[in-house]
Amino acid sequence: FGISGKHFITVTTFTSAGNIGEDGTLSCTFEPDIKLNGIVIQWLKEGIKGLVHEFKEGKDDLSQQHEMFRGRTAVFADQVVVGNASLRLKNVQLTDAGTYTCYIHTSKGKGNANLEYKTGAFSMPEINVDYNASSESLRCEAPRWFPQPTVAWASQVDQGANFSEVSNTSFELNSENVTMKVVSVLYNVTINNTYSCMIENDIAKATGDIKVTDSEVKRRSQLELLNSG
């Protein structure tokens, strides 16, 4: 390694969020080094003895891996030489939340960076016209959220209006007793208007839009993670 111990390399991480029960990615990049065998990647988690993951000499080394991560982690091995040290995490759990350190040692030097990993549940909302209701109403449903989000309605025509008096929101615990199904109904809607259902917690914000006219119904949904770094 020669002078590697005397030089610092730039390591960059991004605060990210994991959707429980799905794959997650802990993002980390570093100054590339074409000598794959000289690259060591170590992922650590605050409060955990042992490693989250280690990759060295071109392959994974799980000899010091903590049991809670056994069989749940992998680096993108073919992207390590171009400076990608991101970690793939299987079946994200609430307990995976915390502060992680991405530590890199290459022939050019060494460096590290921390990232805050948040875990929860978030999903796209779907808005439909509720024809069962006595008056025309809209039903906004999203299958998985945690922690409990806030739900707000907005309308293109009545901008700034408060719809809390004419809407009803419920949170139904899903079968695994962690995440919840969000259902919100907006009453007394008018046609030729666009309505938005906004669901938000400290991890994600999702919006569902619906445009109702005499001839058609148009829908659109989007989801954004509320990253702080």
């Epitope: 799905e22 392959k59 994974d60 799980l62 069989g71 982690t73 992998a74 299987k90 079946n91 695994e176």
Partner: antibody, heavy 121, light 107 residues
Framework: QVQLQQSGAELVRPGTSVKMSCKAS????????IGWAKQRPGHGFEWIGD????????NYNEKFKGKATLTADKSSSTAYMQFSSLTSEDSAIYYC??????????????WGQGTSITVSS | DIQMTQSPSSLSASLGGKVTITCKAS??????VAWYQHKPGQCPRLLIH???TLQPGIPARFSGSGSGRDYSFSISNLEPEDSATYFC?????????FGGGTKLEIK
């Protein structure tokens, strides 16, 4: 391409043990978990357990703890499963399979051809 | 331990038709469900993983969907070579679990 070659069929006596092998080729043996499954006619598949040859780490289905022992030999890229105290209930086809995703335990993406074990006196 | 209840156990369908098989997990939730095709004398073949991701080389006639505890697998435009046993695998937890299998016959 990824290949898993399993040892041949065996006829064994009740109460004895049998050790079957699964030789891997076409990928880095130490970097992927290898899983084992049991198939009996009319019973579908049952998960036995898996092993990470890179460190010898194992996971077992509680039902097969004490019955199955999983090992791996890095030098020959071969995984082994020993079954002990055999009874007629152990008569089945046993499959080994590579778990996709490297150190991440994924789905069973490449399978061996199976080893048929018949337990009979 | 998680159990995967697969249904139906057998079905018969016409050439060119469509079939759907379901697997229900006894508990938990995650997207780690795979679907396999198994023909007599052959080793099982992975068709779909992570609920809906098609393996390379598998035709788009095969599809998967689901969330929570309920997962489904469909084959459309059925062909004679689709006659086989199909089964699901839950691989999200430490202990993996198989569905009981569905034997498909093409008429």
């Amino acid at each position: 391409q990824v290949q898993l070659q399993q040892s041949g069929a065996e006829l064994v006596r009740p109460g004895t043990s049998v050790k079957m092998s699964c030789k891997a080729s076409g990928y880095t043996f130490t970097s992927y978990w290898i899983g084992w499954a049991k198939q009996r006619p009319g019973h579908g598949f049952e998960w036995i357990g898996d092993i990470y040859p890179g460190g010898g780490y194992t996971n077992y289905n509680e039902k097969f703890k004490g019955k199955a022992t999983l090992t791996a030999d890095k030098s020959s890229s071969t995984a082994y499963m020993q079954f002990s105290s055999l009874t007629s209930e152990d008569s089945a086809i046993y499959y080994c399979a590579r778990l996709d995703g490297s150190s991440y335990r994924g789905a069973m993406d490449s399978w061996g051809q199976g080893t048929s074990i018949t337990v009979s006196s | 331990d998680i159990q995967m209840t697969q249904s139906p156990s057998s079905l018969s369908a016409s050439l060119g038709g469509k079939v759907t098989i379901t697997c229900k997990a006894s508990q938990g939730f995650n997207k780690y469900v795979a679907w396999y095709q198994h023909k007599p004398g052959q080793c099982p073949r992975l068709l779909i993983h992570y609920t809906s991701t098609l393996q390379p080389g598998i035709p788009a006639r095969f599809s998967g969907s689901g969330s929570g505890r309920d997962y489904s697998f469909s084959i459309s435009n059925l062909e004679p070579e689709d006659s086989a046993t199909y089964f699901c695998l839950q691989y999200g937890n430490l202990l993996y679990a198989f569905g009981g299998g569905t034997k498909l016959e093409i008429k």
